[in-house]
Interface confidence: low
């Protein structure tokens, strides 16, 4: 079953500044994201921001900036003028919707012992499901491996022999690349037919669009601009990682997320995918 992760991050530079990061671990396509605080929107929570692939974003105070980070993750920066932050013990919830019957919601908060500015993978909290723990363990190994690789590269740099240093690569980029397979693995674990939406195929096996082209939405033409729109979810500063129940719904029709410059919408997206696997048998 698709999962949503939520991470609350305290900025190292401003202790009263917070950012909420949310991601969807697939396999669906995102149509709408709602971020709320104090609980789920409509169940005691207050809406902070809504992000739509085509129609853009809107936010309400104390939200400062909501943006897409990748095709399956978003971030929301929060304003906080007070020295003693009201966000410290607040629950933040993210709801990813994929109409007509896909909507998943999870919540998270800043851990009590927050040490801002640390670059480390999200820490699994106790409620993390056992089947995901193994995957996260694997991602830990991958992270360690990448760290070790980086160490070797740095050692190589200090030798008189010709250097083999990759251009534009830093430890954070390596970490991000190491983290991405973990997400893909989690999605595949829950749905044997899962494909993380890098191909942006409109896998609408249960729907039909007026123009007959596999329900390609009108809002499939926009991609978040800037460096944040990378294909892998970046590693975020230490915070909570919450993988709660699969929110409200499972999808019966999916649509591609925003696509844009440098990203191609593949014309033949009706490849060998099992209908059962996509829509219900999990």
């Amino acid at each position: 079953t698709p999962e949503v992760w939520v991470q609350v991050q305290m900025e190292a530079t401003e202790l009263s500044s917070f950012t909420v990061h949310c991601g969807f671990l697939g396999p669906g396509s995102i149509s709408l994201v709602t971020v709320s605080w104090g609980g789920p929107d409509g169940a005691g929570g207050t809406k902070l921001a809504v992000l739509h692939p085509e129609l853009g974003t809107r936010q309400w105070a104390p939200a400062r900036q909501a943006r897409w980070e990748t095709q399956s993750s978003i971030s929301l920066a929060l304003e906080d003028s007070g020295a003693s932050s009201p966000f410290a013990n607040t629950t933040f919830c993210c709801k990813f919707a994929s109409f007509p019957e896909g909507s998943w919601e999870s919540c998270g908060s800043l851990p009590p012992s927050s040490d801002p500015g640390l670059s480390a993978p999200p820490t699994p909290v106790p409620i993390l499901r056992a089947d995901l723990a193994g995957i996260l363990g694997l991602s830990g190994v991958l992270l360690f491996g990448c760290g070790y690789l980086l160490h070797l590269l740095r050692r190589q740099k200090h030798r008189p022999t010709p250097r083999l240093q990759p251009s534009h690569t830093n430890s954070q980029a390596l970490t991000a690349q190491a983290w991405a397979p973990s997400q893909a693995s989690q999605a595949a674990l829950h749905d044997p037919y899962a494909t993380i939406n890098t191909s942006f195929c409109p896998a609408t096996l249960d729907t039909a669009h007026p123009n007959g082209w596999a329900s390609l939405p009108t809002h499939a033409a926009h991609q978040p601009q800037g460096p944040a729109a990378s294909a892998s979810t970046p590693i975020l500063a230490r915070g909570s990682f919450v993988s709660v129940e699969n929110g409200l719904y499972t999808q019966a029709g999916e649509r591609p997320p925003h696509t844009g410059p440098g990203l191609t919408l593949f014309p033949d997206c009706r490849g060998p995918r099992a209908v059962e696997g996509r829509f219900g048998v999990r």
Epitope: E54, N246, L248, T250, A252
Partner: antibody, heavy 115, light 107 residues
């Protein structure tokens, strides 16, 4: 084939209680969110409550908050609506529905609140 | 709560006619609007979701359009089986709210 079958409707006095059930089949019940929607005789549709796939999240409109409780038993593939402090204006056909929006509906069960 | 105002409340049309039903939301719901068809004594059926996407098995003569606060359901060529009541619904946020309905009758 997706099937939703409601039961438990009937005649009840104002202030009374009633528990509706919705038996589901033809899909993986535990993977889907479910709702109750009602329709008073000759009137339009009104959403009554919603529950997430595992039962963690529940939602209600103000008109029924505190009086109605939605729940589910994923082992039995059954959705419930416990209604208490019933009023005459709660008289309606109650449908259970799957999804967001409501892709599949049951046939409905009539609840009549009258003295 | 978001109010959905549907118009007209009823209309008379003939087989083959083009029929348009409108729905206005009290606030911006982006594209999160669905349309249902209901016949007497039967449960509603989902026709359109997210403004313009036809649900499983829905004929191509049904189409939806709009964005923000104004939405339209169009039946391009009315068929005998299309005489029913149609409802719009916003699925943008809870509480879910429906329009008052439009009854399409035979002229």
């Amino acid at each position: 084939e997706v099937q939703l079958v409601e039961s438990g409707g009937g005649l009840v006095k104002p202030g009374g209680s009633l528990r509706l059930s919705c038996a589901a089949s033809g899909f993986t019940f535990s993977s889907y969110g479910l709702s109750w929607v009602r329709q008073a005789p000759g009137k339009g549709l009104e959403w009554v409550s919603e529950i997430s796939s595992g039962g963690t999240y529940t939602y209600y409109p103000d008109t029924v908050t505190g009086r109605f409780t939605i729940s589910r038993d994923n082992a039995k593939n059954t959705l419930y609506l416990q209604m208490s402090s019933l009023r005459a204006e709660d008289t309606a056909v109650y449908y259970c529905a799957r999804g967001d929006p409501f892709g599949y509906w049951g046939q409905g069960t009539l609840v009549t609140v009258s003295s | 709560d978001i109010q959905m105002t549907q118009s007209p409340s009823s209309l008379s049309a003939s087989v083959g006619d083009r029929v348009t039903i409108t729905c206005k939301a009290s606030q911006d719901v982006m594209t999160a609007v669905a349309w249902y068809q209901q016949k007497p004594g039967k449960a509603p059926k989902l026709l359109i979701y997210s403004t313009s996407y036809r649900f499983t098995g829905v004929p191509s003569r049904f189409s939806g359009s709009g964005s923000g606060t104004d939405f339209t359901l169009t039946i391009s060529s009315l068929q005998p089986e299309d005489f029913a009541t149609y409802y719009c619904q916003q699925h943008y946020s809870t509480p879910r709210t429906f329009g008052g309905g439009t009854k399409v009758e035979i002229k």
